[in-house]
């Protein structure tokens, strides 16, 4: 379907002229940022952004690619090099260290320099690196972590934890030898390393002792508490903070976020990761957009500003399963959260960054017709005279043989939310990819986000923009609307 207006060169000239006019009007804000928001699309490579843009457009009954995402409207863009010190293709732990702490680390470690070694507890001490969120807290700002994964997962843990093994969620996951050497599980670090004002996501089971039933799944032992030390970390967290509240469902979250007496809020909405957006029970679990809104309500009360980490963490999980439908619908909800945050904040005083920690071996090709379903088939047949989908994976669980050959695929199959796109190499889990990812920026000092940069640059831009360590002598004018 070719839109008639797009046949006319005037259409494209006019659109480009408008974009050029907007570009010419861009004025780098020379003030500091009062607030910092980093939106992290876990596994959201550029092919994911493009495919999600088309899907979001098509959900609005448009052809697809012409409708910008919320993140597309950010005026400044850079590329980020995502490699770990020891790996070309990274994981979410060491990348979190890069974009949150400003220092690259080794694969599967969090909050530690590359002098620390994966799984070697005795290499932890002395190699800790401090996140921008921690520095923001020390500067008097309120801080928050919002994610669709467990709050103890690799990406959010980068804001507060230091661990040689990203899988040490609760003490039950930490080998006895490491516990004896003093290495703490991530859940313990969540409540003890620093004072976090808002914590929203999944991960209930790591906070309670083994045998504690889950409120949502009380008859499923596997969803209950996992801790061996007998501790109730939520209770410990509440006891240390006046005005603190714990919630475990959407209704309680909405009530708490509107209560002026609540100064600290922990909301854990699933035992592990939160459900995919397409499976979410909207009466019980909040969406990423709703969690983001609740966090902003609480954090924006602080006249000194805030730091907020918002993660669309299950984009990555959809890709690992080779289920593009899941990855892309997660990306759309992530973009909805970005859009809502934009409505609740001002670009005059808030630096907002959107990026990914890494990409995935996810491709989009095959010359599909404009307006055709992003989950559909390429117009031609493959050399084996069978259909193939426009979305594919380089490797993963989508590699299946039927009678020794690649199975044919129909439009109705490929459009199913459960469908796994085919891959060239059989793996239990599809892998991350090593190419650069995009960084989108808006707000004070956003113009610094340019060119091709190390992933560590992101943390330094945030620290500089808010005049945090090591850039306290930033020489920037105070944020818009402040007097001190």
């Amino acid at each position: 379907i070719i839109p008639v207006e797009e046949e006319n060169p005037d259409f494209w000239n006019r659109e480009a002229a408008e974009a050029l006019g907007a570009a010419k009007k861009l004025q780098p804000a020379q003030t500091a940022a009062k607030n910092l928001i980093i939106f992290l699309g876990d596994g959201m490579g550029v092919s994911t952004v493009t495919a999600a843009r088309i899907l979001k457009g098509q959900k609005k009954d448009k052809l697809g690619p012409e409708i910008p995402l919320a993140m597309d409207r950010f005026p400044y863009v850079a590329l980020s090099k995502t490699y770990n010190v020891d790996k070309h293709v990274p994981d979410s732990g060491a990348t979190a260290t890069a974009y949150l702490c400003g220092v690259k680390g080794n694969f599967q470690t969090i909050g530690l320099s590359a002098a620390a070694r994966f799984n070697q507890c005795n290499t932890t001490r002395g190699n800790e690196v401090i996140s921008v969120m921690n520095r923001a807290k020390k500067a008097g700002k309120s801080v928050g972590v919002v994610t669709t994964t467990r709050v103890q997962h690799a990406s959010p843990a980068g804001t507060y934890a230091h661990t040689v093994n990203r899988n040490w969620y609760s003490d039950a996951d930490v080998p006895a030898s490491a516990r004896q050497e003093g290495c703490q599980d991530i859940a313990t670090q969540l409540i003890s390393n620093m004072d976090i004002d808002v914590i929203l996501g999944g991960g209930r089971k790591y906070m309670f002792r083994m045998g504690t039933p889950d409120p949502e799944y009380p008859d499923d032992y596997s969803q209950g508490g996992t801790r061996l030390d007998g501790k109730n970390l939520v209770q410990e967290w509440l006891a240390k903070r006046q005005g603190a509240r714990y919630v475990w469902n959407r209704t309680e979250l909405m009530q708490a976020s509107l209560d002026p007496s609540v100064t600290h809020l922990m909301g854990l909405f699933e035992p592990g990761d939160m459900k995919y957006e397409i499976h979410r029970d909207s009466t019980l679990d909040p969406s990423l957009m709703e969690m983001t809104e609740a966090a902003l309500r609480l954090l924006s009360r602080n006249p000194r500003g805030f730091f907020l980490f918002v993660e669309g963490g299950r984009i990555d999980h959809g890709h690992h399963e080779s289920r593009a439908y899941r990855a892309l619908t997660e990306t759309i909800m992530f973009d909805d959260a970005i859009e809502r945050a934009g409505q609740l904040t001002s670009e005059e005083d808030t630096l907002s960054l959107v990026t990914a920690d890494h990409s995935h071996v996810f491709s989009f090709g095959g010359y599909p017709l404009r307006g055709s379903s992003i989950f559909g088939l390429a117009p031609g047949k493959a050399r084996d005279r069978k259909a193939y989908t426009v979305l594919l994976y380089g490797n993963g669980p989508g590699y299946v043989l039927k009678d020794g050959a690649r199975p044919d695929v129909t439009e109705s199959e490929s459009g199913s939310p459960e469908y796994r796109q085919q891959s060239a190499v059989p793996l239990d889990e599809e892998t991350h990819a090593g190419e650069d990812v995009a960084v989108f920026a808006r707000g004070p000092q956003a113009h610094l986000v340019h060119g091709v940069q190390e992933q560590t640059f992101i943390a330094h831009v945030m620290a500089f923009a808010a005049c945090l360590e090591p850039y306290t002598a930033c020489d920037l004018a105070p944020p818009a609307g402040t007097t001190d």
């Epitope: 504690t212 039933p213 409120p215 009380p218 919630v247």
Partner: nanobody, 121 residues
Amino acid sequence: QVQLVESGGGLVQPGGSLRLSCAASGSIFSVNTMGWYRQAPGKQRDLVAVATSGGTIHYADSVKGRFTISRDNAKNTVYLQMNSLKPEDTAVYYCNLVVPYGMIAGDHDYWGQGTKVTVSS
């Protein structure tokens, strides 16, 4: 407030059997897990077996096939039938009633005083 009263502990020979029971009284929230934990001298308290109010049962690997947990929801009582007892089963056995955290105000985790089980010839 919830009270838990255990009974049934004692001295038994290896290979023998014992039945522990635990009665809960007070203001008991309907969704809960009742179970048994044990603590041997100088060791930490370990889970033995638990039973949810909905009927799900879970055992520690070390007691599977030898111990059987059962509960009577109407009487708020949980039982532990222990067969083929071994010397390494010697410990203080504690009854526990726990409600999902965040479902009720106040305490959610209650423990009995413990009953001693000694397996020795």
